[in-house]
């Protein structure tokens, strides 16, 4: 230790009165680059948040119902390259959700100008029962919906072949799966290529002749034996899905019409949806034709605008 | 169906060889591993190497042949054998195999089918 | 590295006879095993696949068995033809290494 101690002092010996001005001078300028790091620091968090607010207005989680298809008619195909994939695509349009608070209610017109003549009026005198009602139409403040198409298509020269066993180096493997779906007697056929992918333990394989991928996903398992050892792998088709189109759009109701002010209001939610499709129901009241009315007085309910 | 062996030849040590295996009667498919074996005189079968006749086109070597001795196909019926830095070790007659898989496996495999070989001397 | 071992080197038996050679393998080689015929000037001949099954073609004289790491090929009413070479030979499919593919020694069978 003593002999460290030396060595220390020998050191500050040899340094000049220069240097340590030079040091001061460092320790300054360390100084000002830990507050500008600071500050940066605050900026990138800051920035951080308002990205993660922005990215959560652009995430839509959808329910979409079930669809009944029509099948039209059958396409004869001009070549063999349009036997080798079924494609398909499908529109999908989000339902807008409204949520109408207590107090509130929604008037759809059947008519646009009605509702842009019921909206100008702004304030309107409602007979509820006994009560004289004030109420204010106001355009409905319509949050973002989306619009896109999902195009799918799913190849017949492809299949996906999923659990396959890591009992093998990358390269046997690969000729392990092209040997045994190129077996006929286990209804594989000539096989064009073998994407192999050890991590996942999953392949797409690719065959030469169409027909052999539907042949062999007719069971949902293929037998893959390895040293005598059988592994049955599991067999789906090989689909692509792109999405295409993709829209967002927002705006308000040209036909529907928000209605406040029915706060006080404790009646039933359906006597009183009917009393305001009678007031506007009437031509005198700036109303006209009625399609839907939506009361909310106790809890509040969601209503899904649609194009 | 038959394999023939060609390009052996006498060289001086150092010297490079390039060996063809040419396949009539069958082209190359999935269930064939196409390999080299050579035999020096008077002693037993060594294997050198295989490359898998399917789409992967997988290369197999015996740890002393990496290096210096590599395996092709150069089209679905033939296949060929690089040798460089060759010794007076390496003087054999290098047989072409076709490998067979025999089961609906690929467990089971046999060489069911050899060319007559082709004779390398290396000598100065 | 996969290592065959051929035993005996040399064998001889008077026609009618029975030889038996026997392959060991350094790993286990799952019956994946052939055994093959060779005569002076000659390529070698496929006799037996998967350790036990016989090549079409080959008489049933020729008899292989054996699993694991122990193998065993048997040759019964033996005929003068039946002097030759006979060498084991396996590939393996393995996680650690290449398809390692090994010849054993030979074994040579006199006929008297």
């Known amino acids: 230790m003593e002999a460290d101690k030396d060595d220390t002092q020998q050191i500050l010996k040899e340094h000049s009165p220069d240097e340590f001005i030079k040091d001061e001078q460092n320790k300054g300028l360390i100084d000002e680059i830990t507050k500008k790091n600071i500050q940066l620091k605050k900026e990138i968090q800051k920035l951080e948040t308002e990205l993660q607010e922005a990215t959560k207005e652009f995430q839509i989680k959808e329910d979409i119902p079930e669809t009944k298809m029509k099948f039209l008619s059958v396409e004869t195909p001009e070549n063999d390259s349009q036997l080798s994939n079924i494609s398909c695509s499908f529109q999908v349009s989000s339902k807008v959700p409204y949520e109408i608070q207590k107090g509130q209610a929604l008037i759809t017109f059947e008519k646009e100008e009605v509702a842009q003549n019921v909206v100008s009026m702004s304030k309107h005198h409602v007979q509820i029962k006994d009560v004289n009602l004030e109420v204010t139409a106001k355009p409905v403040p319509l949050n973002s919906g989306v619009r896109f198409q999902v195009y799918v298509e799913v190849s017949k020269m492809k299949i996906n072949v999923t659990e396959i066993p890591d009992t093998l180096r990358e390269d046997q493997m690969r000729d392990k799966l092209e040997l045994s779906f190129s077996k006929s007697r286990n209804g594989g056929g000539e096989v064009d290529r073998v994407d192999y992918d050890r991590q996942s333990g999953s392949a797409v394989i690719t065959f030469v002749e169409i027909g052999v991928a539907d042949k062999i996903l007719k069971k949902k398992e293929y037998p893959l034996y390895i040293n005598q050892t059988c592994h049955r792998v599991t067999v789906s088709p090989y689909t692509e899905i792109h999405l295409k189109k993709y829209q967002i759009f927002s705006g308000t109701s040209k036909r529907t019409v928000l209605l406040t002010g029915m706060e006080g209001i404790q009646m039933d939610e359906e006597i009183v949806e009917d009393l305001i499709n009678i007031h506007f129901q009437r031509a005198k009241n700036g109303g006209g034709e009625v399609d839907v009315v939506k009361c909310s007085l106790g809890q509040p309910h969601i209503a899904y605008f649609e194009e | 169906q038959s394999l023939e062996e060609s390009g052996g030849d006498l060289v001086k040590p150092g010297a490079s060889l390039t060996l063809t295996c040419t396949a009539s009667g069958f082209s190359f498919s999935s269930s064939y591993y196409m390999c080299w074996v050579r035999q020096a005189p008077g002693k037993g079968l060594e294997w050198i190497a295989c490359?898998?006749?399917?789409?992967?086109?997988?290369t197999y070597y015996a740890s002393w042949a990496k290096g210096r001795f590599t395996i092709s196909k150069t089209s679905s019926t033939t296949v060929t054998l690089q040798m460089t830095s060759l010794t007076a070790a390496d003087t054999a007659t290098y047989f072409c195999?076709?490998?067979?898989?025999?089961?609906?496996?690929?467990?089971?495999?046999?060489?069911?089918?050899w060319g007559p070989g082709t004779l390398v001397t290396v000598s100065s | 590295a996969l290592v065959m071992t051929q035993t005996p080197s040399s064998v001889s038996a008077a026609v009618g006879g029975t030889v038996t050679i026997n392959c060991q393998a350094s790993q286990n080689i799952y019956t994946n095993l052939a055994w093959y015929q060779q005569k002076p000037g000659q390529p070698p001949k496929l006799l037996i696949y998967?350790?036990?099954n016989l090549e079409s073609g080959v008489p049933s004289r020729f008899k292989g068995s054996g699993s694991g790491t122990e193998y065993t090929l048997t040759i019964s009413d033996l005929e003068c033809d039946d002097a030759a070479t006979y060498y084991c030979?396996?590939?393996?499919?393995?996680?650690?290494?290449?398809?390692?593919?090994?010849f054993g020694g030979g074994t040579e069978v006199v006929v008297k």
């Open positions: 195999a076709r490998e067979y898989s025999y089961d609906d496996y690929g467990d089971f495999w046999g060489a069911n089918l």
């Open positions: 030979q396996s590939s393996l499919y393995s996680r650690i290494a290449d398809r390692a593919n090994a």
């Open positions: 998967g350790a036990s």
């Open positions: 490359i898998y006749a399917g789409s992967s086109g997988s």
